[in-house]
Amino acid sequence: ALDTNYCFRNLEENCCVRPLYIDFRQDLGWKWVHEPKGYYANFCSGPCPYLRSADTTHSTVLGLYNTLNPEASASPCCVPQDLEPLTILYYVGRTPKVEQLSNMVVKSCKCS
C-alpha cells in the first residue's frame, strides 16, 4: 500500500504520500486554534506508471495507454486514498470547544 508506513521509509519517486507539516498560526493565519499548534496534513505526489496502485479499471487502462503512448498527456493522477480526522481545541470566550475535523490527514495515496 502507498501509505505512510511504506512511503516515509523509502525513497520512492512514483506516486506516494509525502510528509507535509502545517503550522496553523504561521502557515494559515489561524491564530485562534489552541491545540494542536499544527499537524502533518501530508500530500500525494509522483507519477502513476502502469499498474501502480490503480484505483479503477479506467486508471489501469489510462496507465497502460500512457505507457504505450509516452507522448500522450493523459495519465492517472496521484490522489489521496485514506484520510483520517484531526481533533482541535479552541476557546469561545473562555469556554473550551473540541471539534473533530474530518478528512484532514492523508494516510495513503492511489492512482486514479
Epitope: G29, K31, W32, Y91, V92, G93, R94, T95, K97, E99
Partner: antibody, heavy 121, light 111 residues
Framework: EVQLVQSGAEVKKPGASVKVSCKTS????????MNWVRQAPGAGLDWMGQ????????NYNEMFEGRVTLTADTSTSTAYMELSSLRAGDIAVYYC??????????????WGQGTLVTVSS | DIVMTQTPPSLSVSPRETASISCRAS??????????MHWYLQKPGQSPQLLIY???NLESGVSDRFSGSGSGTDFTLRISRVEANDTGVYYC?????????FGQGTKLELK
C-alpha cells in the same frame, strides 16, 4: 481592499424565513470567522453567531432560540444567515462582520453595509 | 451573559473639548493578561467601525485623538479635541465570555 457586500432589503410575512447573503472580497475568506450582528430600529447591537468558513464550524447566541442558521460557500467567498419563524420583533438591520482574527470570539474589524429585514402581514 | 452598561446614554460636547464614555461590565473581562474589551463608533446611517481593540490598542487608520483605558470591569473611551466627524453612537463590546455582548450605546453630539 477588504469588502463585505450584503444582499438587498427584504420584506417577509410572519412565520416565514429570510436568507441574507454577504459576499466578501479582498482577503482570504477561509482564514477569518464571520459574525452576524443585528440592530433593531433605534436600538443597540446584538451578536447572533459566527461561522468559520473553512469547515463550517458555528457558534450561536442562545438568545435566537435555534432560529438562526449560518452557512458559507467557500467557492464564492460568501456567507449566509437564515432566520426562521420571523416575527415583528425581528425587524432590524442585519450585519455581517469579519472577526479580527486572533480569537474565535473577537472584535470585528470589517462590516457589511447592512440588510434591512421587515416583517409585515 | 455579561451585561455591558455604558454611561452616559448621551452627551453633548463643544468642539475641541474632550469627551469621556464609560463602560462597566457585570463581571471581569480580563483573561490571560488581556482585557477583552473593544470600542466602536456608528456614524448616522453607517455600519459600526472598530476604534479600539483590547481596551487600549488603536485600530489602524483611526485618529490618535481616540484612546481607551481600563481593566477588569471598568473601561473608558476618551475623545480629545472633538470634531463634527466624531458624532454618532459609541458602543463597547466584550468577548471574554460567550455570548459576545455590546453596551447599549452612547450618543455623542456637538453643542
Amino acid at each position: 481592499e477588504v469588502q463585505l457586500v450584503q444582499s438587498g432589503a427584504e420584506v417577509k410575512k410572519p412565520g416565514a424565513s429570510v436568507k441574507v447573503s454577504c459576499k466578501t472580497s479582498g482577503y482570504t475568506f477561509m482564514t477569518y470567522w464571520m459574525n452576524w450582528v443585528r440592530q433593531a430600529p433605534g436600538a443597540g447591537l446584538d451578536w447572533m453567531g459566527q461561522i468559520f468558513p473553512a469547515w463550517g464550524s458555528t457558534n450561536y447566541n442562545e438568545m435566537f432560540e435555534g432560529r438562526v442558521t449560518l452557512t458559507a460557500d467557500t467557492s464564492t467567498s460568501t456567507a449566509y444567515m437564515e432566520l426562521s419563524s420571523l416575527r415583528a420583533g425581528d425587524i432590524a438591520v442585519y450585519y455581517c462582520a469579519r472577526g479580527y482574527g486572533n480569537y474565535a470570539l473577537d472584535a470585528m474589524d470589517y462590516w457589511g453595509q447592512g440588510t434591512l429585514v421587515t416583517v409585515s402581514s | 451573559d455579561i451585561v455591558m452598561t455604558q454611561t452616559p446614554p448621551s452627551l453633548s460636547v463643544s468642539p475641541r473639548e474632550t469627551a469621556s464614555i464609560s463602560c462597566r461590565a457585570s463581571e471581569s473581562v480580563d483573561s490571560y493578561g488581556n482585557s477583552f474589551m473593544h470600542w466602536y463608533l456608528q456614524k448616522p446611517g453607517q455600519s459600526p467601525q472598530l476604534l479600539i481593540y483590547l481596551a487600549s490598542n488603536l485600530e489602524s487608520g483611526v485618529s490618535d485623538r481616540f484612546s481607551g483605558s481600563g481593566s477588569g470591569t471598568d473601561f473608558t473611551l476618551r475623545i480629545s479635541r472633538v470634531e463634527a466627524n466624531d458624532t454618532g453612537v459609541y458602543y463597547c463590546q466584550q468577548n471574554n465570555e460567550d455570548p459576545l455582548t455590546f453596551g447599549q450605546g452612547t450618543k455623542l453630539e456637538l453643542k
